[in-house]
């Protein structure tokens, strides 16, 4: 997270690392209590790598009575996800068992009604992401607010170029943004999931580059079905 | 298959106004800034501005910037280029295109000519 | 305003021929984002512009492989390697990186 501040401690009760061998690969959000979301992209290289998905965080490193690392029973990224593209960067990872729920663990209503957030929305986003172009990475949890984009602009040649689908939404990018690392975590507006942010080499912090998310509003039957 | 049409082209006297319309399909149409363009007979292309047509933001080159405005009605996705004072100048093929990717998508034009 | 200088305004060629069209910037067109929007289009008489390359050197989807652009700061090409009849038409390079978007006055590809 670019230009964020440290998270309230165990206040995204739904946030998830989801890490590779031990390390925090991506983000994640906790959608039921068996299921992380994530973006597909995150497990392009994990090749035979071990993935575990840690819930109940605030720091990384620092023991926490709710932190727990789950291993991961099954994987499934979108069908349609590709590596060359944005598109259909979803991933759900099914934990090996059901999640410990308690007030630092807890599952986040998603949206499922298939209509846009209205530009200039304020939305949390939150990860342990970079947090400077150096690529620092954080210990605890980092957040930002930042307002919805209208598609129009996203799309212009100069910002995504027609890329962005009516599958995806995009986020001021400002000097505040998510970065590398923060990919598959939630961007939450008024309290319900509405994004993932999608897991492409972009450029952070650079006001013409929109932050990209997949709205998971559009891939509600696909959520489902993965969940039944 | 995206699709822009133009209509509202032809024959006005110097002085007099027209409002040419550009019909989009087969794409949101709140999801693409629509640009315009005109073309004089034997010249080159022209960029008159853009609109967005969530916001209805507009940007116009400042040569046409006190005579034309751009205007929409989404319910229609349709966007408009409301001229006036046309001169004799102002003859044209004029073209909307929607930005993104580029301006990969083209109506076909509507001619405009200004003459007494 | 940025300036589009293209060179040469017109020029006679025989199917086959290597072509190439340059386009000069009166400034850097390089974006704030570090981009460059420097793109080409074709249009043959009567019709809109069509789409061939965008930022320098990407061609569009379905434009033919003998198209291509190169180029930096201010000095741009548009090569086509073997012309062929279809490409018998007038080309323009365009920057988007600044207000006022710009075209360049055009080159006329004519048959020898």
């Known amino acids: 997270i670019l230009g964020g501040r440290e998270a309230e401690a165990h206040a995204r009760p739904y946030m998830a690392s989801v890490q590779l061998n031990g390390a925090h690969l991506c983000g994640g959000v906790l959608v039921a209590e068996q299921w992380v979301l994530s973006a597909a992209h995150c497990l392009e290289d994990a090749a035979d790598g071990k993935v575990q998905v840690l819930l109940g965080a605030h720091s990384l490193s620092q023991p926490e009575p709710s932190k727990r690392l789950y291993d991961v029973l099954r994987a499934v990224p979108h069908p349609d996800s590709q590596p060359d593209t944005i598109d259909h960067d979803l991933l759900l990872l099914q934990l090996s068992e059901k999640a410990t729920l308690g007030p630092a663990v807890r599952p986040l209503p998603w949206q499922r009604v298939d209509r846009d957030v209205a530009p200039g929305t304020l939305c949390d986003v939150a990860g342990w992401g970079i947090v400077n172009h150096a690529g620092r990475r954080p210990d605890s949890l980092q957040h930002v607010l930042l307002p919805v984009l209208d598609r129009a602009t996203c799309n212009r040649r100069t910002h995504h170029d027609g890329a962005i689908t009516e599958r995806l939404m995009c986020a001021e990018s400002n000097r505040r943004d998510s970065c590398k690392g923060d990919s598959g975590g939630p961007l939450v507006c008024g309290g319900v999931l509405e994004g993932v942010v999608t897991s492409g080499s972009r450029v952070c912090g650079n006001r013409k580059k929109p932050g990209i998310y997949t709205r998971v509003a559009s891939y509600a039957a696909w959520i489902d079905s993965v969940l039944a | 298959e995206v699709q822009l049409v133009e209509s509202g082209g032809g024959l006005v006297q110097p002085g007099g106004s027209l409002r040419l319309s550009c019909a989009a399909s087969?794409?949101?149409?709140?999801?693409?800034?629509m640009n315009w363009v005109r073309q004089a007979p034997g010249k080159g292309l022209e960029w008159i501005g853009d609109?967005?047509?969530?916001?209805?933001?507009?940007d116009y080159n400042a040569d046409f910037k006190r005579r034309f405005t751009f205007s929409l009605d989404t319910s229609k996705s349709t966007a408009y280029l409301q001229m006036n004072s046309l001169r004799a100048e102002d003859t044209a093929v004029y073209y909307c295109?929607?930005?993104?990717?580029?301006?990969?998508?083209w109506g076909q034009g509507t001619l405009v000519t200004v003459s007494s | 305003d940025i300036q589009l200088t293209q060179s040469p305004s017109s020029l006679s060629a025989s199917v086959g021929d290597r072509v190439t069209i340059t386009c000069r910037s009166s400034?850097?067109?390089?974006?704030?984002?570090?981009?460059?929007?420097l793109e080409w289009y074709q249009q043959k008489p009567g019709k809109a512009p069509i789409l061939l390359i965008y930022k320098v050197s990407n061609r569009f989807s379905g434009v033919p492989s003998r198209f291509s652009g190169s180029g930096s700061g201010t000095d741009f090409t548009l090569t086509i390697s073997s012309l062929q009849p279809e490409d018998f038409a007038t080309y323009y390079c365009f920057q988007g990186s600044h207000v006022p978007v710009t075209f360049g006055q055009g080159t006329k590809v004519e048959i020898k």
């Open positions: 400034q850097t067109i390089v974006h704030d984002n570090g981009d460059t929007y």
């Open positions: 087969g794409y949101t149409f709140t999801d693409y800034y």
């Open positions: 295109t929607r930005e993104g990717p580029s301006f990969a998508y």
């Open positions: 609109i967005n047509p969530v916001t209805g933001d507009t």
